[in-house]
């Protein structure tokens, strides 16, 4: 008789997940010497324990403390750069802008990256199936219980002058339910942060609005400005020049300090 | 070292044509996005025009826009601005120049610039 | 479309501190940059991003930017200082230079 398995609303596990974390841990610890010293065989085992065996709508911050600790790493506090809703062009821009750091260029933000992972109450199986979603399901989700986790310890991390990237092509440009909007702005300390600078990716040169009004950017600006954050927005209407220095790294216009 | 060197300026009647040529060395000229600038006698800096890296848009001050056309060859590394009828006001140094390639969006190197006179 | 507005003229003595400002609708809301401009010469940009010298521009040149006012600040101005300063925004579609400043050294 085939056991009966709950139906969650999300897709399920990405495909060879183990196969992928471990591989993906390798990879960055070679690329990078700071992190030489992690076992990855060690960081595997700590994710499978955060959510093997729980049910996946009970995850909770502490089952992903084992991993934290494991991926502890000092990323420069003042070269922060946080995103909402445009991941692809923060992350061109930080290969471009060396040292610059978005969450993903941390090794657990690494690992995670566009993967979803779940498991089973009382099984030690992965759930290749399907998966909570955040909405139709459960927001204690082994995914969102980890992005929540690390984003909060990533913006609580940051100083001096923090930039975030932010989409002004959608409806809301700043979104309070999204991880920035919910997380990261909440958990950036006053006593280390001076200034939140907002980078508003315009969808093209065409559009001259100056986005820096919107009301949901003066909303950010107040949730700031309360917490004795200095707020600053700047309007960035060429997005495709991240391209070009995609293309051309090397070039010193593209590797001048931010 | 970047360097951009104009030519095609010179005298040219009202209502005439000209156009200006602007040769890029000593960089990777199809990633850059391009412009050109004026200065007319004892006056300041105007923003004439600009060209996106693979020329695929172009952008007009508003008192050159249906005369003015620029274009580039990324082959020959050479930026074009095309000036048809030309007015007395349309008088000054135009210079090529170069848009910085990252977050900040501001023009990084010029070239020495090319005089047009129009004139009767 | 925004409007860029400088003063005509500042003077500074030697050694001095020179400001030069640049005044906008909200212009805090975009990255400004400044050029100098010698007689007979091109444009050289000596600040951009608001407040991000070049490689190659001293140390004494800064800039700052925010509310409608940007600011060029030459500390312990020099002879060779003496040049035309403009301002320069992009705005969407189009950049915006301001009308320029004359900078003289007395």
């Known amino acids: 008789v085939p056991r009966w398995r709950q139906q969650w609303s999300g897709p399920g596990t990405t495909k060879r997940f183990p196969e992928t974390v471990l591989a993906r841990c390798v990879k960055y610890t070679e690329i990078h010497p700071e992190m030489r010293h992690v076992d990855c065989q060690s960081v595997w085992d700590a994710f499978k324990g955060a959510f093997i065996s729980k049910h996946p709508c009970n995850i909770t911050e502490e089952d992903y403390q084992p991993l934290m600790k494991l991926g502890t790493q000092t990323v420069p506090c003042n070269k922060i750069l946080l995103w909402s809703r445009i991941k692809d062009l923060a992350h061109q821009f930080t290969q471009v802008q060396r040292d610059m750091f978005t969450l993903e260029d941390t090794l657990l933000g690494y690992l995670a990256d566009d993967l979803t992972w779940c498991g089973e109450f009382n099984t030690s199986k992965i759930n290749y199936q399907s998966c909570p979603d955040w909405r139709k399901d459960c927001s204690n989700n082994p995914v969102s219980v980890f992005w929540k986790t690390v984003s909060r310890r990533f913006a609580e991390a940051a100083c001096d002058v923090v930039h975030v990237m932010l989409n002004g092509s959608r409806s809301k440009i700043f979104d309070k339910n999204s991880t920035f909007g919910s997380v990261e702005v909440h958990n950036l300390q006053p006593e280390k942060v001076q200034t939140l600078e907002a980078w508003v990716i315009h969808g093209g040169r065409e559009d001259s609005r100056d986005l820096c009004q919107d009301p949901t950017i003066k909303e950010l600006e107040s949730i700031i400005s309360k917490r004795n954050i200095q707020f600053s927005c700047k309007n960035i209407y060429r997005p495709d020049k991240f391209l070009q220095c995609v293309k051309n790294p090397e070039d010193s216009s593209c590797t001048s300090e931010i | 070292q970047v360097q951009l060197v104009e030519s095609g300026g010179g005298l040219v009647q009202p209502g005439g044509s000209l156009r200006l040529s602007c040769a890029a060395s000593?960089?990777?000229?199809?990633?850059?996005?391009m412009s050109w600038v004026r200065q007319a006698p004892g006056k300041g800096l105007e923003w004439v025009s600009a060209i996106r890296y693979d020329g695929s848009n172009t952008y007009y001050a508003d008192s050159v826009k249906g005369r003015f056309t620029i274009s580039r060859d990324n082959s020959k590394n050479t930026l074009y601005l095309q000036m048809n009828s030309l007015r007395a006001e349309d008088t000054a140094v135009y210079y090529c120049?170069?848009?910085?390639?990252?977050?900040?969006?501001?023009?990084?190197?010029w070239g020495q610039g090319t005089l047009v006179t129009v004139s009767s | 479309d925004i409007e860029l507005t400088q003063p005509p003229s500042v003077s500074v003595a030697p050694g001095q501190t020179a400001r030069i400002s640049c005044s906008g609708d909200n212009i805090g809301h975009y990255y400004v940059s400044w050029y100098q401009q010698k007689p007979g010469q091109a444009p050289v940009l000596v600040i951009y991003?608001?407040?991000n010298r070049p490689s190659g521009i001293p140390e004494r040149f800064s800039g700052s930017n925010s509310g409608n006012t940007a600011t060029l600040t030459i500390s312990g101005t020099q002879a060779e200082d003496e040049a035309d300063y403009y301002c320069a925004s992009d705005v969407g579609s189009l950049d915006v230079f301001g009308g320029g400043t004359k900078l003289t050294v007395l």
């Open positions: 120049a170069r848009y910085y390639s990252g977050i900040y969006q501001h023009i990084d190197y």
């Open positions: 000593g960089f990777t000229f199809s990633d850059y996005a």
């Open positions: 991003g608001d407040n």
